[in-house]
Interface confidence: low
């Protein structure tokens, strides 16, 4: 299936260029999308172009400006929130990234009201978190680890936490591990829906082993970064969870949630908090062995002022075949009578799908079904779910959003999005405005992106947000690659693979074979999606043939493909991404002299165990940031999905499984070996342990570091990186600069 | 200065159709809603519905639903309002009127009225 | 849809006294930013004219003796020194919700 029919024609072919590796780097194709952001049901906010703050209403079709750039300017804004009563705005600067979604900055309350900045009892700084009540203008802030609350924004504050200490107590925030692997937020504090009550969580790190790394700097010494990290098998953070009334907070003071009996027996994680009701919350535990979740939804005796978490309203989730849930364990949606919710597990056939449970899990009814997936769940109204699959025609790379009423009986089913734009766009994902008044669609390709703002009701498109028609325009004399999707079908096992080829593809030709591999437990990488990136250059312009296959371990079709991998990480992923280079020199085209891999991360890991599997398929490869071995990664992700390093537990496949015990098979390849050395994330001590072996076992690889770079190498290393791996895999492929 | 001036008094029979115009000036007219509002004699005022120039959103009152018809033509900045099978209690001044430009429902700038007879 | 009950009927003052007409909706038609209530004037032959918008916000152009309170169902217009050219029908209207409604008039005539 062409999802990019090439425009060249013979009579253009002189007007039309290929893609530069400039291009790229300098994001000259690069889409724009429009996410309203919302504030009733219909109205939203939008940041303009030249950095207004507009407030857009759907039904009267005015739009005023709320907040002038000369504001925003004043204090060096790059983000805003809108009190919900809409009298104040916190304006943020001095934007300092941490980890993955972790900042500081420096927040100002500017009144409407009045137009002016609020004075006295001014926010510290610089603050880790804040947030809006979702009623009138309460403000909650995290400030060294401690957690205060403001009634109003001119108010002294009032301080929750006294017991916050940097890299030992985090309140209201995450610590590292939470954040990246469990939370994915920058925050652990959660007000309920009217904003009487704050909860929050209390992560202590106090035994947690530190990873500890050089920070070059500019100095004359180096600073050594610190942080709790806890590493496969080692202690984990210790959470509580906390609920204060924010109207009287000194009255009880926070009253700790009490965790479920079956969890506590033994380490556990917090997963994640959902408001009921004002005096209704939800909590999610899992067990440290990831297959056992419980759901528990608790209330708030007034008579005692605590929370009450009945065992009849704890539902345990649990997987006999792999992990808890997806990446995640799903969140539970609630229906309008505050206690029955609908939520995505799988079903008897291994099947991710929603749920509607009203008493037990046991006697859950199952609302979607099928050889597909239910990905997400965005809204419940009283007549209505909205959620996404990769049901349409078959192809798990695909998001359509559908629309199930709930109101009538039997409930009926609509794809909402399967035929808007049926060439241009085949994967979704949406954003709904309070009651599902009104939503934006934003489709992501397989065509240009487009955003567009619906009827709720109707589902009629209203308007279009974004067209890219810059982009578009841009884009008509560049010689794009073709790109198909497809499946193979191997030893009962199908794996879809996305190609990339070259403008003028010839199948009577040779053409060199770039994987590229991510592969990683519960990801997808053949996805409906527009991109114009490096792989995309490779192909226009140095004619390569660039695949990316999905095998074992990934995710959206079925628990078998993905607990495929279950105690057994490095093994599936790289015999799938073997079976499928086989596949494509059995297709005629590829030149199998010059076939090589690369990959990021966890495909940094796949393709070096893939150059090193022996095979003599790969002639080079390339591996950034790899994990080397389990032991060396994340407790929360890795023992997900690989157990413990114990004796009694999982050591031997940690240990059979590093990309070290394979140095010698690196001999016969062009291995190109990349790491920034403040990589927080997958540490630089993985690479460095690669590069020991293969110099212990006197193998020659090439190798290039970032300093002071993290796992995601910005900036200027960007360009340097792909400069760098452009002019490996020319050479590799014995192609002209 | 913003102005809304509006096409001359009818007289119409029953049944027939009446289509008031209301021609915009001083303002970029497809930004702010038109409103009609009507007024029969010696009553109060009674709000028909809304027409958006720039987006095309319109809405009608229930009571007025399936016999009113609300356009628009950008390029001369007029309004129209159209009310079909007219019956003698449509006898009155119909007026169009801006909606302010602080948004939120207030009418700042009036037409100054069409008065519409039906009468047999 | 929300009603207005505007009291009294009519208002019979004399210039230089001061007015206070109410409007009281069904409903509240407040939210916790804003009243989305306004107030007219009409004067024989005329199209209404915007004096109060939001409750208590003047419009440009009218003159302070004009004055507008209240929130959640109960809303006042204030006239504080009565002018001969006062001497017209008033009109409430809210915007809260669909369909727009207008209360049924006060008049205030001249004593």
């Known amino acids: 299936i062409v999802l990019r029919p090439s425009r060249v024609h013979n009579s253009e072919e002189n007007t039309m260029r290929a893609l530069t590796l400039k291009d790229i780097l300098n994001g000259t194709f690069s889409y724009k999308t429009f996410f309203p952001n919302w504030i009733s049901g219909q109205e939203y906010l939008h940041q303009s172009a030249d950095n207004n703050i507009v407030l857009y209403n759907i039904e009267t079709g005015q739009s005023y400006t709320i907040l002038s750039n000369r504001t925003m300017k004043s204090v060096n804004a790059s983000n805003y929130g809108l009190s919900p009563d809409r009298q104040f705005v916190y304006l943020e600067s001095d934007y300092s990234k941490l980890w993955r979604y972790s900042y500081t900055a420096t927040y100002y309350i500017y009144d409407l009201s009045n137009g002016e900045f609020v004075r006295g009892n001014e926010l510290p700084r610089p603050i880790q978190y804040l947030c809006w009540s979702p009623v009138g203008s309460k403000l909650a802030y995290v400030y060294q680890n401690n957690i205060y609350l403001k009634q109003r924004p001119g108010d002294p504050p009032f301080q929750i936490t006294f017991n916050g200490r940097e890299n030992k107590i985090f309140n209201g925030i995450p610590d590292w591990v939470y954040e990246e692997e469990m939370l994915a937020t920058k925050y652990a504090l959660w007000w309920s829906p009217n904003g009487k009550f704050l909860a929050y969580a209390e992560f202590n790190d106090t035994d947690i082993p530190v990873i500890a790394y050089s920070y070059y700097g500019d100095e004359q010494y180096p600073r050594t970064i610190n942080i709790p990290y806890p590493k496969a098998g080692a202690k984990n953070p210790v959470v509580r969870i906390f609920i204060i009334d924010t109207t009287y907070p000194a009255y009880v003071g926070p009253q700790e949630v009490p965790v479920p009996a079956m969890i506590a027996s033994s380490d556990y994680y917090f997963s994640w908090l959902t408001w009921v009701t004002d005096e209704r919350v939800c909590l999610q535990w899992l067990k440290r062995v990831q297959n056992v979740s419980v759901l528990s939804i608790c209330d708030f005796r007034e008579d005692w002022q605590t929370w009450d978490c009945p065992k009849t309203q704890e539902h345990i989730e649990e997987s006999r075949t792999g992990w808890a849930g997806g990446f995640f364990v799903s969140t539970p949606v609630f229906s309008y009578d505050a206690i029955s919710y609908y939520k995505i597990f799988s079903d008897k056939d291994g099947y991710k799908h929603i749920h509607y449970i009203k008493d037990t899990v046991e006697n859950a009814i199952q609302i979607t079904s099928g050889k597909w997936e239910a990905i997400n769940i965005f809204r419940v109204t009283q007549d209505s779910l909205f959620y996404s699959s990769n049901e349409f025609e078959e192809y798990p790379g695909r998001r359509n959003i559908y629309r199930i009423s709930i109101g009538s009986y039997p409930p009926s089913k609509k794809c909402v999005t399967c035929h808007l734009r049926k060439e241009r766009c085949q994967y979704y994902t949406a954003s709904f405005s309070d009651y599902a008044k009104y939503y934006a669609l934003v489709c992501y390709g397989p065509g240009i992106p487009i955003s567009t703002l619906h009827d709720g009701r109707t589902d009629q498109e209203i308007k279009i947000l974004e067209e890219n028609k810059e982009l578009e325009n841009a884009l008509k004399n560049i010689q794009l690659p073709k790109e198909e999707i497809k499946k193979l079908e191997v030893d009962e096992i199908t794996l879809w693979y996305k190609m990339i080829l070259p403008p003028q593809f010839d199948r009577s030709k040779k053409y060199p074979l770039l994987i590229q591999v991510y592969g990683g437990p519960c990801s997808q990488s053949v996805r409906s999606v527009f991109a114009v990136n490096w792989i995309s250059y490779l192909a226009s312009k140095e004619g390569m043939v660039i695949a990316l296959v999905d095998g074992r371990g990934t995710a959206f079709q079925g628990d078998k493909l993905l607990y495929a991998v279950y105690r057994k990480l490095g093994v599936y992923e790289v015999e799938d991404q073997i079976t499928a280079v086989r596949k494509f020199i059995e297709m005629g085209f590829i030149d199998e002299k010059r076939i090589a891999i690369w990959g990021w991360s966890y495909g940094g890991y796949v393709s070096s165990l893939a150059l090193a599997s022996g095979t003599g398929l790969f002639k080079c490869g390339i591996a950034v940031a790899p994990v080397s071995s389990w032991e060396y990664y994340a407790s929360v992700y890795t023992e997900r999905f690989m157990g413990l390093p114990t004796k009694d537990d999982n050591l031997e496949h940690y240990k059979n499984s590093t990309v070290m015990a394979r140095a010698e098979y690196f001999r016969n390849v062009d291995y190109l070996l990349i790491h920034g050395t403040a990589d927080d994330n997958v540490h630089f001590q993985n690479s460095a342990q690669i590069a020991k072996a293969l110099v212990n076992a006197q193998v020659d690889f090439q190798a290039m570091w970032y300093s002071d770079q993290n796992h995601g190498l910005s900036g200027l290393s960007t360009n340097h990186l792909y400069t760098h791996m452009t002019h490996f895999l020319k050479q590799c492929f014995s192609l002209s600069d | 200065q913003v102005q809304l001036v509006q096409s001359g008094a009818e007289v119409k029979k029953p049944g027939a159709s009446v289509k008031v115009s209301c021609k915009a000036s001083g303002y970029t007219f497809t930004e702010n809603i038109i409103h009609w509002v009507r007024q029969a004699p010696g009553q109060g005022l009674e709000w028909m519905g809304w027409i958006h120039p720039g987006s095309g959103s319109i809405k009608y009152a229930q009571k007025l639903q399936g016999r009113v018809t609300m356009t628009t033509d950008t390029s001369t900045s007029t309004a129209y309002m159209e009310l079909r099978s007219l019956r003698s209690d449509d006898t009155a001044v119909y007026y169009c009127?801006?909606?302010?430009?602080?948004?939120?429902?207030?009418?700042?700038?009036w037409g100054q009225g069409t008065l519409v007879t039906v009468s047999s | 849809e929300i009603v207005l009950t505007q009291s009294p009927g009519t208002l019979s003052l004399s210039p230089g006294e001061r007015a206070t007409l109410s409007c009281r909706a069904s409903q509240s038609v407040s939210t916790s930013a804003y009243s989305y209530m306004h107030w007219y004037q009409q004067k024989p032959g005329q199209a209404p004219r915007l004096l109060i918008y939001l409750a208590s916000n003047l419009e440009s152009g009218i003159p302070d003796r004009f004055s507008g309170s209240g929130s959640g169902t109960d809303f006042t217009l204030t006239i504080s020194r009565l002018e001969p050219e006062d001497f017209a029908v008033y009109y409430c209207q809210q915007s809260r919700e669909l369909p727009y409604t207008f209360g049924q008039g006060t008049k205030l005539e001249i004593k």
């Open positions: 009127a801006r909606h302010g430009a602080t948004g939120r429902g207030a009418m700042d700038y």
